[in-house]
């Protein structure tokens, strides 16, 4: 069976069917359908037009504008909000009713695209094997990144997430047409990885997308991740006007120049250095989402009621932060370079700058208690590996799970390590799972490109398209038409069960409790030491305007450091790509597979981005919930700075009106936008097309500044600032 | 100018089928979709499917859907629209309408043909 | 389907008077356009994409709203104004609302 043409929303849309097999199977590709009008630079999607005729919807689209590789020059389009649509066929009639599962790619909110990078003329987030294996429709789309996306001056003039907004209208109109093309629009799934996953996350979290999304997946990211929310936006947004010319002083005409001015110039205002960093990756990236008080109303943690009946995945990598912490600490992939306490020292004092001298010392213990037993260069190696993994990326996923668990009402909650080792041959034997060697398993690529894969890679392939499609059709990864290899039994806070994804699996991969004694440091000890002012802070960094790699704002430190500006002196991107040069390991929209990866993939690693640190840990293990930390009477987050306030103010930790307590057990899910001394707030209606929910009309150039509570109701506690 | 001509009334016994005409003029015929809706006395409006005439690809409401067929002949620039199975409940005014421009705004409608179903 | 539901179903007003008849939709929708019919007349298009008017459009008819909450409103009613206008979402089923007669007072 076959589709022909189907008639969308726009007009009509004709792909390709592409037979498989001899037993009549086959599978309908749509490459390109818009799903929103051209963009313009700076300002919120708007709906498509429409067209006459039958769109030829054969090819994949250009990306959105965004940087090089080589971060000289740009790539893609402006005009980029298209996305792909991936539906399985069986032999007679029309498929009907078909789950539908979209991703959202990764890429630090600063690159990537909709196909993923080309390996093998196979595009990374080819949706074949998931949809023909798993019998669901799959979806991919492109939205806007880096200043193009995520550029905001923190107030209305240029409130930001348009990125976020053109993942909302996608999803809006998958929810509107997709039954056209044989899908349930009533059983949308999201899933993504790294800035994809935690995309998902804010998805969820957003009152803009009441009622359009069922179920969700995060691989290596979510809305809690500290590189996820940036909490001085401004800052970023001066730093690219200085760089192209626009006035600086008066918000308003800022944003004014900003918008006019031409968007590849906007895209090189901004540079990621790789190499000789004074501070780790993470803090360089300032272009992600913020809480702008209307698409993200207030601070995630305070959202989770908003997915209270979202079914939701979770997990990592076993070593996700394997590649940031290569990047961070170059001899960790060098057999003969050694890393020494000095040099993790450093870098622990980097992350834990608000805490000044004793939240580094603290840390360094915690992290070296091994080191006595085992000072092998191989064990600290995988400490330096763990630390980034743990503040990155498992900490903040942990309580992520917590937090949709104790608001869930219907909804269903799992969690997985995934730990089938990285298989990039330039990386030493003892390297796990690192940051999207998830994603071939997931898309597939065992099976699609079979000889760069061994069996047990098939195995792990089929495994994780199994659980993942079950879960989109029924909320249980167990329970579908795919069998699974053991029984996947629901994250709950009693027993913070997780699923290990290896190539053997059986009973003993639901595990309890994934590193306890780290996650407690976190939400516990680390939580309640004082914040330091800004002359107590360490390491001091650099200044002026010397050719030393620029310093970014550190979280919530009270100095705002210089972030890299362009024409920095920081060393240039590792050429890859179809340079010849050598490679680079997959990442965020890279992801390649095993073999190193070529073709146009090999987007270095860009980390994952934002200001701030792990945050606070749920209840784990046998212990009940964990000791609060102290409550000051606040209880609110702090706000982020609007308009010119300059660098971002610290937010109340430690015995200085620490953040509420998190509840436990049953007690009431937080408010779903904080605001005033309601009990809860209500949910803003939904809008697809780029205007805020009523009241705030129009596609209102006003941001509200998000709301603040000064209830003194439990709430969960406000996410660690590093 | 755009003008959107449609056949006569008619009337039929619930079993049967009607085919009812709309003659396009003034425009690319090949260049808009063409759009069925019907009003039945007294009711609301309630869309029926459409059709492109440059290739003849159509869309049916879910409601019409093993029904409806809608064909056109761009020789003469008409698209015919044939409701098989009639009931007593098709009795209604079947408008033929074109998009404005993009997709869905109907920018021009036909004058209407009144089908009766009665035995 | 996506359900369109219009209020009030009905209204008397008088010439001169501003009037306003709203939609709303069952889920988020991306366009949304309105249609004025007269008894015995073809329905004919006022206003589409939530805002524009086609030419020869009188400019007393304004449309506004996104999402799912849409307005129509007419600022000064004229003789020529009494009849039934409809709402109708863009999707690949397209739906209109139920309708809204507008009467003479």
């Known amino acids: 069976a076959k589709l022909g043409a189907v008639y969308t929303e726009g007009g009509f849309v004709e792909g390709v069917n592409k037979k498989l097999g001899l037993l009549g199977d086959s599978v309908d590709i749509f490459k390109g359908i818009p799903f929103a009008a051209p963009t313009k630079a700076l300002e919120n999607p708007q709906p498509h037009p429409g067209w006459q005729g039958t769109l030829k919807a054969k090819n994949f689209k250009k990306r959105c504008l965004q940087a090089t590789i080589t971060q000289d020059s740009t790539y893609g389009d402006e005009d980029c909000l298209y996305l792909n649509i991936w539906v399985p066929q069986g032999r007679k009639q029309v498929s009907r009713d078909l789950p539908v599962m979209i991703w959202i790619y990764g890429g630090a909110f600063l690159m990537g695209s909709g196909h993923g990078a080309n390996f093998l003329n196979n595009y990374l987030y080819d949706g074949e094997e998931i949809a023909t294996r798993g019998n669901v429709i799959v979806v991919t789309f492109n939205y806007r990144v880096g200043p193009l996306g995520f550029l905001s001056t923190g107030d209305a003039n240029l409130p930001g997430n348009y990125g976020l907004r053109d993942q909302h209208m996608a999803i809006a109109w998958v929810k509107r047409n997709i039954a056209a093309f044989g899908g349930d629009p009533n059983n949308i799934t999201l899933f993504g990885e790294s800035a994809g996953g935690a995309s998902v996350s804010l998805q969820t979290l957003s009152p803009y997308n009441k009622g359009l999304i069922r179920r969700a997946i995060s691989q290596s990211g979510v809305a809690l991740s500290p590189w996820v929310i940036q909490k001085n936006p401004l800052f970023w947004a001066k730093k690219v006007a200085e760089k192209v010319g626009c006035p600086v002083g008066d918000a308003a005409r800022m944003a004014q120049c900003l918008k006019v001015t031409d968007p590849r110039a906007l895209t090189l205002a901004y540079k990621v250095p790789l190499a000789g960093l004074e501070y780790p990756m993470l803090h360089y990236v300032g272009f992600v989402p913020v809480i702008d008080g209307d698409f993200i109303p207030a601070d995630p943690i305070n959202l989770y009621a908003n997915a209270a009946d979202i079914d939701y995945i979770a997990g990592t990598n076993n070593m996700d932060g394997h590649i940031f912490a290569s990047i961070d600490m170059p001899a960790i992939n060098k057999g003969n370079k050694k890393v020494t306490e000095e040099d993790f020292y450093k870098l622990v004092s980097e992350f834990t700058i608000t805490k000044g001298l004793r939240g580094a010392k603290t840390t360094f213990d915690v992290y070296t208690e091994s080191w006595a037993q085992d000072p092998s260069q191989e064990n600290k190696k995988k400490t330096v590996v763990d630390f980034e993994t743990d503040v990155l990326f498992l900490v903040p996923t942990e309580i992520a799970l917590a937090q949709h668990r104790a608001n869930a009402k219907s909804a269903k909650t799992y969690a997985y390590l995934f730990s089938h080792p990285s298989r990039m041959p330039v990386y030493p034997k003892w390297v796990g799972a690192d940051h999207a060697d998830d994603i071939q398993y997931v898309f597939g690529k065992p099976f699609a490109t079979p000889t760069g894969y061994r069996p047990q890679d098939r195995t792990v392939s089929k495994a994780m398209i199994a659980y993942w499609t079950n879960f989109a059709k029924t909320g249980d990864p167990n329970m579908g038409d795919s069998a699974v290899p053991t029984h996947w039994e629901p994250y709950t806070t009693e027993n913070s069960g997780y699923l290990e994804i290896t190539k053997k699996m059986g009973s003993s991969s639901m595990k309890r409790s994934l590193r306890t004694n780290f996650l407690r440091y976190w939400t516990l000890t680390y939580l309640a030491l004082p914040t330091v002012t800004d002359q107590e802070a360490t390491p001091v960094p650099p200044t002026g305007d010397s050719e030393a790699t620029p310093v970014p704002p550190t979280g919530d430190s009270e100095t705002a450091p210089v972030p890299p500006t362009g024409d920095s002196g920081a060393p240039p991107v590792p050429p890859t790509g179809d340079s010849g040069a050598p490679p680079v390991p997959p990442t965020g929209d890279s992801g390649a597979p095993p073999v190193p990866p070529t073709g146009d993939s090999g987007a270095p690693p860009v980390p994952p981005t934002g200001d701030s640190g792990a945050p606070p840990v749920p209840p784990t293990g046998d212990s009940g919930a964990p000791p609060v930390p102290p409550t000051g009477d606040s209880g609110a987050p702090p706000v982020p700075p609007t308009g010119d306030a300059g660098p971002p103010p610290v937010p109340p930790t430690g015995d200085s009106g620490a953040p509420p307590v998190p509840p436990t057990g049953d007690s009431g899910a937080p408010p779903v936008t904080p605001t005033g001394d309601s009990e809860t707030a209500p949910v803003p209606p939904t809008g697809d097309s780029g205007a805020p929910p009523v009241p705030p009309t129009g596609d209102s150039e006003a941001a509200p500044v998000p709301p603040t509570d000064d209830s003194k109701e439990a709430q969960m506690p406000a996410v660690i600032r590093f | 100018q755009v003008q959107l001509v449609q056949s006569g009334a008619e009337v039929k016994k619930p079993g049967a089928s009607v085919k009812v005409s709309c003659k396009a003029s003034?425009?690319?015929?090949?260049?808009?979709?063409m759009h069925w809706v019907r009003q039945a006395p007294g009711q609301g409006l309630e869309w029926i499917g459409v059709?492109?005439?440059?290739?003849?690809?159509?869309s049916y409401a879910q409601k019409f859907q093993g029904r409806v067929t809608m064909t056109r002949d761009t020789s003469t620039s008409t698209v015919y629209m044939e409701l098989s199975s009639l009931r007593s409940e098709d009795t209604a005014v079947y408008y033929c309408?074109?998009?404005?421009?993009?997709?869905?705004?109907?920018?021009?409608w036909g004058q209407g043909t009144l089908v009766t179903v009665s035995s | 389907d996506i359900q369109m539901t219009q209020s009030p179903s009905s209204l008397s007003a008088s010439v001169g008077d501003r009037v306003t008849i709203t939609c709303r939709a069952s889920?988020?929708?991306?366009?949304l356009n309105w249609y004025q019919q007269k008894p015995g007349k073809a329905p004919k298009l006022l206003i589409y994409?939530?805002?524009r008017l086609p030419s020869g459009v009188p400019s007393r008819f304004s449309g506004s709203g996104s999402g799912t909450d849409f307005t129509l409103t007419i600022s000064s009613l004229q003789p020529e104004d009494f009849a039934t206008y409809y709402c109708?979402?863009?999707?690949?089923?397209?739906?209109f609302g139920q309708g809204t007669k507008l009467e003479i007072k």
């Open positions: 309408a074109r998009d404005y421009y993009g997709s869905s705004p109907l920018g021009y």
């Open positions: 003034g425009y690319t015929f090949t260049s808009y979709n």
């Open positions: 059709i492109n005439p440059s290739d003849g690809a159509t």
């Open positions: 889920s988020s929708i991306s366009y």
């Open positions: 994409a939530a805002s």
């Open positions: 109708q979402q863009r999707s690949s089923s397209p739906t």
